[in-house]
């Protein structure tokens, strides 16, 4: 028969022959022959391969370095890499999460739109009219101004994006 020029999915071409790729979690020990199947071996402890492959070496699991603020979010298997995340109050500097930085706080006049996670920083938004934030915080949202009317009071000092309104008693008209 004519030697193949292309192989099926999960196969590779070598020596004019289609050999089976090794499944995820296993590495290539020896190519197949006309008579004998590809020989694969499971990856060792702390190693992985996440695709059908012909790799002769497995990849090392990622190390979540505590000195960089990292911790293990999901332990690696023979088929998956370890997933790192950051310690409480910190977040990853990149998608690969190779190091961490402290969550940023939202300054007065800004509130938290989205609280930071292990992989994303705090998202701040300016407090719109009717709302304020008088603290620097990584958790506080913009608070609505106090409604003086519901307390039977009147506005004595207008609120800003950094300060609440100041309410005071209404002036009573004398009879």
């Amino acid at each position: 028969p004519e030697p193949p020029t292309a192989c099926r999915e999960k196969q590779y071409l070598i020596n004019s022959q289609c050999c089976s790729l090794c499944q995820p979690g296993q590495k290539l020990v020896s190519d197949c022959t006309e008579f004998t199947e590809t020989e694969c071996l499971p990856c060792g402890e702390s190693e992985f391969l996440d695709t059908w492959n012909r790799e002769t070496h497995c990849h090392q699991h990622k190390y979540c370095d505590p000195n960089l603020g990292l911790r293990v979010q999901q332990k690696g298997t023979s088929e998956t890499d370890t997933i790192c995340t950051c310690e409480e109050g910190w977040h990853c500097t990149s998608e690969a999460c190779e190091s961490c930085v402290l969550h940023r706080s939202c300054s007065p006049g800004f509130g938290v739109k989205q609280i930071a996670t292990g992989v994303s920083d705090t998202i701040c938004e300016p407090c719109p009219v009717g709302f304020f934030s008088n603290v620097s915080s990584a958790f506080e949202k913009c608070h609505p101004w106090t409604s003086c009317e519901t307390k039977d009071l009147v506005v004595q000092q207008a609120g800003t994006n950094k300060t609440d309104v100041v309410c005071g008693p209404q002036d009573r008209l004398r009879a």
Partner: antibody
């Protein structure tokens, strides 16, 4: 460790049939090609047949082509040699052997053999 | 078919002395991957054959290093650097380059 145990040999008349079996252990049988090799009394080795790990390829020596058929059952971890129209010159010890693959093409582990005597 | 020949067909050696067996093929056993598809086997008296050398020069696991294989194309040699009493038997070369696989006639090695 790799072990191959042949059975099914015996005395048979010319023109009759016999089926040899080879039970394998100690390795992943379904990943390896397998051979039959024979040796007539006091003679040298003669390669008889080979079958690939998933049965897609099988080859037979010209001397047995059309009479002998190599086959395997991976679920039973067993290799077979169906021998029809036997002749006196088929008298031999029949060995089954594992193919060594890319690092050692050809038989690398052999069984102890089973004797087939074709005589009237 | 590829025809294999061996010489000598019989050899008597003194323990501790070297020995050499030649094997020739009627066609080249060198494959495009750079390997020679030539194996050497030893069949000790009353035993099954055992592989000594694969791919012309690769010693099989457990085989003493006094055995070595060399050669390329059509001419191959098996050398025993210092023969021991346990090395007696018949030595066969076999080509695995193409089917039908074929063996040489064998070389009978005896100890003096």
């Amino acid at each position: 460790q790799v072990q191959l145990v042949e059975s099914g040999g015996g005395v048979v008349q010319p023109g009759r049939s016999l089926r040899l079996s080879c039970a394998a252990s100690g390795f992943t049988f379904s990943s390896y090609g397998m051979h039959w090799v024979r040796q007539a009394p006091g003679k040298g080795l003669e390669w008889v047949a080979v079958i690939s790990y998933e049965e897609s390829n099988r080859y037979h020596a010209d001397s047995v082509k059309g009479r002998f058929t190599i086959s395997r059952d991976n679920s039973k971890i067993t290799l077979y040699l169906q021998m029809n129209s036997l002749r006196t010159e088929d008298t031999a010890v029949y060995y089954c052997a594992r193919d060594g693959g890319i690092a050692a093409p050809g038989p690398d582990y052999w069984g102890q053999g089973t004797l087939v005597t074709v005589s009237s | 078919d590829i025809v294999m020949t061996q010489s000598p067909l019989s050899l008597t050696v003194t323990p501790g002395e070297p020995a050499s067996i030649s094997c020739r093929s009627s066609q080249s056993l060198l494959y495009s991957n750079g390997y020679n598809y030539l194996d050497w086997y030893l069949q000790k008296p009353g035993q099954s054959p055992q592989v000594l050398i694969s791919l012309g020069s690769n010693r099989a696991s457990g085989v003493p290093d006094r055995f070595s294989g060399s050669g390329s194309g059509t001419d191959f040699t098996l050398k025993i650097s210092r023969v021991e009493a346990e090395d007696v038997g018949v030595y066969y070369c076999m080509q695995a380059r193409q089917t039908p696989f074929t063996f040489g006639p064998g070389t009978k090695v005896d100890i003096r």
